[in-house]
């Protein structure tokens, strides 16, 4: 049997059963999540669940830019340092940059400081690029 790889929406890229869209425009975290959802297919701000997934995403983004942080789907909705993925994925893989926590910073971004492989927390109303993900 021939197994066809699922296709992603135009402009999205495929990796290990998921489609990713890197949006190089400015949104706060909640507006970014709304835009992701608007694409249907269960799309959300991206969960990053392994180093392999993180590395693939980082390599893709580095082809566009290397200086701007990017919203991902990790947030702290209760503001109690109880982080969770907006798509419901298990919060097992962690890649915090170390000096991330504290203040009114309850949304996570991929940090450009380590080639997008580590995360930092930031104020959710900050407007920046974002990454969406869905399973086709």
């Amino acid at each position: 049997d021939i197994i066809m790889r699922p296709s992603c929406a135009p402009g999205w890229f495929y990796h290990k059963s998921n489609c990713y869209g890197y949006f190089r425009k400015l949104r706060n975290w909640s507006d970014a999540e709304l835009e992701c959802q608007s694409y249907g297919n269960g799309a959300h701000l991206a969960s990053i669940l392994s180093l392999k997934e993180a590395s693939t995403i980082a390599e893709y983004i580095s082809g566009y830019q290397r200086s701007q942080p990017i919203w991902i789907g990790l947030h702290d909705p209760q503001k109690r340092q109880q982080w969770q993925w907006i798509d419901g994925a298990m919060y097992l893989y962690r890649s915090w940059s170390g000096k991330s926590m504290g203040g009114n910073k309850h949304c996570a971004e991929m940090s450009s400081n380590n080639n997008f492989l580590t995360w930092s927390s930031n104020e959710c109303n900050k407007r920046q690029h974002f990454l969406c993900k869905y399973r086709p």
């Epitope: 949006f23 190089r24 425009k25 400015l26 949104r27 507006d31 709304l34 835009e35 959802q37 608007s38």
Partner: antibody, heavy 119, light 111 residues
Framework: EVQLLESGGGLVQPGGSLRLSCAAS????????MSWVRQAPGKGLEWVSA????????YYADSVKGRFTISRDNSKNTLYLQMNSLRTEDTAVYYC????????????WGQGTMVTVSS | FMLTQPHSVSESPGKTVTISCTGS????????VQWFQQRPGSAPTTVIY?????PSGVPDRFSGSIDSSSNSASLTISGLKTEDEADYYC???????????FGGGTKVTVL
């Protein structure tokens, strides 16, 4: 052919209201964020408002916030701008513009509709 | 956040003109810059998007660049033609307040 066609402009008194429409054709309207941009006579371009493809998120310039409302009807492929409490400084040609999904870059513009606010 | 352009530039046919667009704060390289051409009585059209990309149909005489050291973007038109006579606007994004920001426009005159 990808096209945007504005309508609804005209002469209105200060304090009055007007609703502009922008009819889109030739593309999947709901997949694109849209903006209104205006240009006062002899002046430069000024961004007014934007709306996401789904209509779930809206954005406004400070100069129109609380007076203008942007909306869209994806079933009719139409973008709207409801303008209330109009002022003389709102006199301008109003353009609708399509934005690229991944970058917000304007790629298609309508031909514009003239709004004149005068007593 | 503001984008400042020269009010006007003029040059002879066949020559090269460069229009600058300087950001008032932050780093202009942080967000994409677009350039629009507007001929009298017409709607704007895009000549450069994403800093240096040309839409199909725009001649390669038009080019865009970013200079982080001067916090400015530039539009260069080489081999100037009479049909290039128009107003040119730069546009970018404000990550703190406004959603979209336009420069004040530059009138290009072909002598």
């Amino acid at each position: 052919e990808v096209q945007l066609l504005e309508s609804g402009g005209g002469l209105v008194q200060p304090g009055g209201s007007l609703r502009l429409s922008c009819a889109a054709s030739g593309f999947t309207f709901s997949s694109y964020a849209m903006s209104w941009v205006r240009q006062a006579p002899g002046k430069g371009l000024e961004w007014v408002s934007a709306i996401s493809g789904s209509g779930g998120s809206t954005y406004y310039a400070d100069s129109v916030k609380g007076r203008f409302t942007i909306s869209r009807d994806n079933s009719k492929n139409t973008l709207y701008l409801q303008m209330n409490s109009l002022r003389t400084e709102d006199t301008a040609v109003y353009y609708c513009a399509r934005q690229q999904p991944f970058t917000d870059a304007f790629d298609i513009w309508g031909q514009g509709t003239m709004v004149t606010v005068s007593s | 956040f503001m984008l400042t352009q020269p009010h006007s530039v003029s040059e002879s046919p066949g020559k090269t003109v460069t229009i600058s667009c300087t950001g008032s704060s932050g780093n202009i390289a942080n967000n994409y810059v677009q350039w629009f051409q507007q001929r009298p009585g017409s709607a704007p059209t895009t000549v450069i998007y994403e800093d240096n990309q040309r839409p199909s149909g725009v001649p390669d005489r038009f080019s865009g660049s970013i200079d982080s050291s001067s916090n400015s973007a530039s539009l260069t038109i080489s081999g100037l033609k009479t049909e290039d006579e128009a107003d040119y606007y730069c546009q970018s994004y404000d990550s703190s307040n406004l959603y979209v920001v336009f420069g004040g426009g530059t009138k290009v005159t072909v002598l």
